[in-house]
């Protein structure tokens, strides 16, 4: 708490300007009116204040708005936003995308802080869903934002928002998240032609089921190995050697380098060795010729 002391003669602030630049902590507290500060918040960002001075200004706003700042003040917080705690931010009602952008701009270059995470959470909850404009904004500032959401949170993303997602936005997504995003992407891009569709859907294929991979194998897509290695193992296992060959096209040669890694390793174990030999890559570990393969999972399903 800052001690309450009378403002020295001639030091009362008539406006927020650089005359306050070297005010001591107690002078700022005594000489700056909180209501004046609230109406001229935009000026604070044009004045280099020390962190101690910013703490005083924040304290004044906290006293004026104990239930949380109005959006007119929040939008102009600028550098002062970095002094806010998640608890402060939980009191806010931020509805304008412009306000969100202004505050994210302040935090640019920093990691996503607890303050920013709380701000985004408040904003998205207030909107009810992650619409395209919001997602556009968030992924522009934080490419990994989408992958920081739980599958439950991702379920509120409308398919139309998927158009805003760039491949790098999905780099850190795990299979559970891609399981949620893939059907949305499939829906979003459904009216595109084959090659264009593949370019757009490629980053989401870590959530694709077997039947969709089989369908892609009929379209000469030439999937690269990096994409193939990110596919769900359970979706790759039922694919035949011919289907994988068609799916990868000229990239099929890359299977040799990945034969010890999932999902290639597990897929090889499920294929007949003579089928693997047709690829001419020297892949080993398939089912020897003459062996009978029983699909016990199918038998259990029937019983």
């Amino acid at each position: 708490e800052v001690e309450k002391t009378a403002c020295p003669s001639g030091k009362k602030a008539r406006e927020i300007d650089e005359s306050l630049i070297f005010y001591k902590k107690w002078e700022l507290e005594a000489c700056v009116d909180a209501a004046l500060l609230a109406t001229q918040m935009d000026r604070v960002n044009a004045i280099p204040f020390t962190y101690e001075q910013l703490d005083v200004l924040k304290h004044k706003l906290d006293e004026l708005y104990p239930q949380g700042y109005p959006e007119s003040v929040i939008q102009h917080l600028g550098y002062l936003f970095l002094k806010m705690s998640p608890e402060d931010i939980r009191k806010w009602n931020v509805t304008s995308l412009e306000t969100l952008k202004a505050l994210l701009e302040v935090n640019k270059g920093h990691e996503m802080s607890p303050q920013v995470a709380t701000l985004i959470d408040r904003f998205v909850k207030g909107r009810g869903q992650l619409d395209k404009d919001t997602l556009d904004t968030l992924t522009a500032f934080y490419p990994g934002y989408l992958c920081s959401l739980s599958p439950e949170e991702l379920s509120s993303v409308p398919p139309s928002s998927i158009w805003a997602v760039r491949p790098q936005d999905l780099d850190t997504c795990d299979p559970r998240q891609l399981d949620v995003l893939y059907p949305k992407a499939r829906l979003a891009f459904q009216n595109m032609n084959g090659s264009e569709y593949f370019v757009k859907i490629q980053s989401f294929l870590g959530g694709a089921p077997t039947e969709d991979l089989k369908a892609l194998s009929q379209q000469n897509v030439s999937m690269d190995l990096a994409t193939f290695m990110k596919l769900r193992t359970d979706a790759v296992l039922p694919l035949t050697v011919a289907e994988v060959q068609k799916l990868l096209g000229p990239h099929v040669e890359g299977l040799k380098a990945e034969e010890r890694h999932r999902p290639v390793r597990d897929w090889i174990l499920r294929q007949r060795q003579d089928d693997l030999d047709t690829l001419g890559l020297g892949l080993q570990g398939g089912i020897p010729n003459g062996y009978l393969v029983l699909d016990l999972s199918m038998q259990e399903a029937l019983s």
């Epitope: 650089e18 005359s19 630049i21 070297f22 001591k24 902590k25 960002n45 044009a46 280099p48 204040f49 020390t50 962190y51 101690e52 001075q53 910013l54 703490d55 600028g78 550098y79 970095l82 002094k83 920093h110 990691e111």
Partner: antibody, heavy 119, light 106 residues
């Protein structure tokens, strides 16, 4: 090009005076607070003085208060440091530094000018 | 506020990971900057707000800490990194600098 260039350093006797200048270019000079920072030979950095963008507010380290005066001429994009009653302990390289727009770190420095106070 | 840097000097080889610490006599939040100074040259800003990398500074430099204890790390020392490093607080006036840490070639 964004730069700061100090001048006016030299040898002066104890009790004497000297005026340092710092010519700024490549940025809107009047929009930024400016500072003088000094470094005695073989020693660390010491903040000496600062001035607001318009020149209306100034600050001095206790070690120079009452002896040094900081000022600026925004029409000439120039910062000044008038040094009076100089002492041997004022011997240092004096750097002019631009203050960040939002808070008090220095994002641009001049190359410095040497002030030697000796009889 | 006094800033104490340690060590005051250190010897290291190219490729080494180097860590310099700066301790404040009282809490300063994240109001700390780091500068690099080479002999006969002006200081150059590396890090501000304790951990934000100044534009154009190589990513091998990083800063961390909050309150009273701060660290500057050079992940893989390069020949051009041999210099003296200073921390500076901007929590309150007067602004103060640490005493410096000289990084020399082993």
């Amino acid at each position: 090009e964004v730069q700061l260039l100090e001048s006016g350093g030299g040898l002066v006797q104890p009790g004497g005076s000297l005026r340092l200048s710092c010519a700024a270019s490549g940025f809107t000079f009047s929009s930024y607070a400016m500072s003088w920072v000094r470094q005695a030979p073989g020693k660390g950095l010491e903040w000496v003085s600062a001035i607001s963008g318009s020149g209306g507010s100034t600050y001095y380290a206790d070690s120079v208060k009452g002896r040094f005066t900081i000022s600026r001429d925004n029409s000439k994009n120039t910062l000044y440091l008038q040094m009076n009653s100089l002492r041997a302990e004022d011997t240092a390289v004096y750097y002019c530094a631009k203050v960040d727009r939002t808070t008090w770190y220095f994002d641009l420095w001049g190359r410095g000018t040497l002030v030697t106070v000796s009889s | 506020i006094q800033l104490t840097q340690s060590p005051s000097s250190l010897s290291a080889s190219v490729g080494d990971r180097v860590t310099i610490t700066c301790r404040a006599s009282q809490g300063i939040s994240s109001a700390l900057a780091w500068y690099q100074q080479k002999p006969g040259k002006a200081p150059k800003l590396l890090i501000y707000d304790a951990s934000s990398l100044e534009s154009g500074v190589p990513s091998r430099f990083s800063g961390s800490g909050s309150g009273t204890d701060f660290t500057l790390t050079i992940s893989s020392l390069q020949p051009e990194d041999f210099a003296t490093y200073y921390c500076q607080q901007f929590n309150n006036y007067p602004l103060t600098f640490g005493g410096g840490t000289k990084v020399e070639i082993k």
